[in-house]
Every structure is written in structure tokens, then in C-alpha cells.
Interface confidence: medium
């Protein structure tokens, strides 16, 4: 018979006949041959191969840096990688997350709408009318003006997007 | 007929070293890749080391890497591994085999128990 030119789902061509790949999570040692199947051995303790291949070595799994602000979110195993991400307070600076810096905090006159993550960064808005924020925070929303009238209060002074309005008590007409 | 026949295995100390030996016939034991293989009581079959058919190539599971040596003499068609520093770990009934693929072997030899105890 002529020797095949394309192999099937999971195989490969070499030395004009169609070997099995390796599946997930082991390494190519040995090609198939005429008497014998393709050998593949498992990756080691910190190594990889997450799809069906003919690798002689397998990849290593990714080193979470805590010195870079990271740390791991999930444990490679023998069929995929470590993901890292980062330390509470920091966000990636990649998808890949290579590496992390310190979440942005919101200005005053600024008040956070989103709250960071590890993957992604505070972000902030201005604070509309009605509302301030008198502090530099990652957390802090922009807080409503007090009301003076549940208060039985007038308003003294008047608020603005980083400060509150200050209430006073109301002027008694003197008899 | 494709016959293994393993021998060495034994009672030693931790610490300690043996050396199993395996025995092949009915097949031309200088053209297959072969292997160890061990099973520990009441655990699975794992695989040891791998020698390719010339001897040239070699490979370790982590767990006995550094410790144990694969070889093989083909002109007395004959697979050796050399075990030191042996653990109490190591306990388990060893296997020469060829052909693994998929987590199966095509032929595998009876066994020799090695016992590492003090």
C-alpha cells in the first residue's frame, strides 16, 4: 500500500506512517515504528503540556514572583499552566500578569466606582453635585451632602464635590 | 514468547541500595525501549525510569531521581536498575517492561518485591 501523506485526528506523519500524539499532560520519548506505538512519558511534578503533541520536553509550570506582587490563583497541573495573579491591593499590569502594581486611588472630588481586582484597576468618577468624597481611598464611594431639613438644620455652607455642607440651626425671628 | 523475568528485589535498610536485574527473551531485546514500572501495596502502577533501545537516552520519575539508574547490556539482553539511598517510600514490587504507551505496557514481567524497613 502507498504510505499515507495525512494522518487522522490526533496522529502525526513520520517516516511516511502516522504515529499517535501524546495526550494532554505527557511528552513525546519514542516515535512510533513498524512493531510499536508511540511511547510518552508524564511531565514532571512542575511541568506542562496542555494539548495533544509530539514535544520531547515539557514546559514549566509559571513561577507566581511574590517579589513582582504576585501570587497563584490556581495550581498548574500536568495538563495546564499555574495562573498568578496579584497580591490584595495590587493588579496586573498584562492579561499574562507578568506582573503587578499598586491599585490607583480615587482623588478627593473623586469617589471609586469600580473597586479594583487583581486583574484590573480602581476607577474612579466625580463626584456630582449632591455628593462628595474629602478622601484619597481605593474603597471610598462618593458620599451624599447631608441633609440639613431631616435635621430641622439650614444649610450654613454650602457643599462641594470634595466637601460636605455644614448645617446650622435655623435663625429664630427674636419677638 | 516475549518473556521478563526480574530478580534482586529484597528486604534492605533505608539508606540502603539493590541492584534488580531483568532478563528478556523471545523478542530482539536491542531494538525496544524499555522500562520499570513499581506498584505499591494497595496504589497504582507507576512508572520508574525509561532506556531507549541503545542505552543512549534515559529518564526518571521525579520521585527517584538522583537515586536510581537504569542500564542495559544488549549483548546479554539484560535490563539492570541500580536503586540507592532507598526510602521506606520505595516499597513496592517492581516491573521490567516494554512498550508503554497510554498507561498500558504490552508485556510486563511477574515482579520482584523490594521492602525498604528498618
Known amino acids: 500500500p502507498e504510505p499515507p501523506t495525512a494522518c487522522r485526528e490526533k496522529q502525526y506523519l513520520i517516516n511516511s506512517q502516522c504515529c499517535s500524539l501524546c495526550q494532554p499532560g505527557q511528552k513525546l520519548v519514542s516515535d512510533c515504528t513498524e512493531f510499536t506505538e508511540t511511547e510518552c512519558l508524564p511531565c514532571g511534578e512542575s511541568e506542562f503540556l496542555d494539548t495533544w503533541n509530539r514535544e520531547t520536553h515539557c514546559h514549566q509550570h509559571k513561577y507566581c514572583d511574590p517579589n513582582l506582587g504576585l501570587r497563584v490563583q490556581q495550581k498548574g497541573t500536568s495538563e495546564t499552566d499555574t495562573i498568578c495573579t496579584c497580591e490584595e491591593g495590587w493588579h496586573c499590569t498584562s492579561e499574562a500578569c507578568e506582573s503587578c502594581v499598586l491599585h490607583r486611588s480615587c482623588s478627593p472630588g473623586f469617589g471609586v466606582k469600580q473597586i479594583a481586582t487583581g486583574v484590573s484597576d480602581t476607577i474612579c468618577e466625580p463626584c456630582p453635585v449632591g455628593f462628595f468624597s474629602n478622601v484619597s481611598s481605593a474603597f471610598e464611594k462618593c458620599h451624599p451632602w447631608t441633609s440639613c431639613e431631616t435635621k430641622d438644620l439650614v444649610v450654613q455652607q454650602a457643599g462641594t464635590n470634595k466637601t460636605d455642607v455644614v448645617c446650622g440651626p435655623q435663625d429664630r425671628l427674636r419677638a | 514468547e516475549v518473556q521478563l523475568l526480574e530478580s534482586g528485589g529484597g528486604l534492605v535498610q533505608p539508606g540502603g541500595s539493590l541492584r534488580l536485574s531483568c532478563a528478556a527473551s523471545?523478542?530482539?531485546?536491542?531494538?525496544?525501549n524499555m522500562w520499570w514500572a513499581r506498584q505499591a501495596p494497595g496504589k497504582g502502577l507507576e512508572w520508574v525510569s525509561?532506556?531507549?533501545?541503545?542505552?543512549?537516552?534515559?529518564y526518571y520519575a521525579d520521585s527517584v531521581k538522583g537515586r536510581f539508574t537504569i542500564s542495559r547490556d544488549n549483548s546479554k539482553n539484560t535490563l539492570y536498575l541500580q536503586m540507592n539511598s532507598l526510602r521506606a517510600e520505595d516499597t513496592a514490587v517492581y516491573y521490567c517492561?516494554?512498550?508503554?504507551?497510554?498507561?498500558?505496557?504490552?508485556?510486563w514481567g511477574q515482579g520482584t518485591l523490594v521492602t525498604v524497613s528498618s
Open positions: 525509561w532506556i531507549n533501545s541503545t542505552g543512549s537516552r534515559t
Open positions: 517492561a516494554k512498550n508503554w504507551h497510554r498507561g498500558r505496557f504490552d508485556y
Open positions: 523471545g523478542f530482539t531485546f536491542s531494538a525496544y
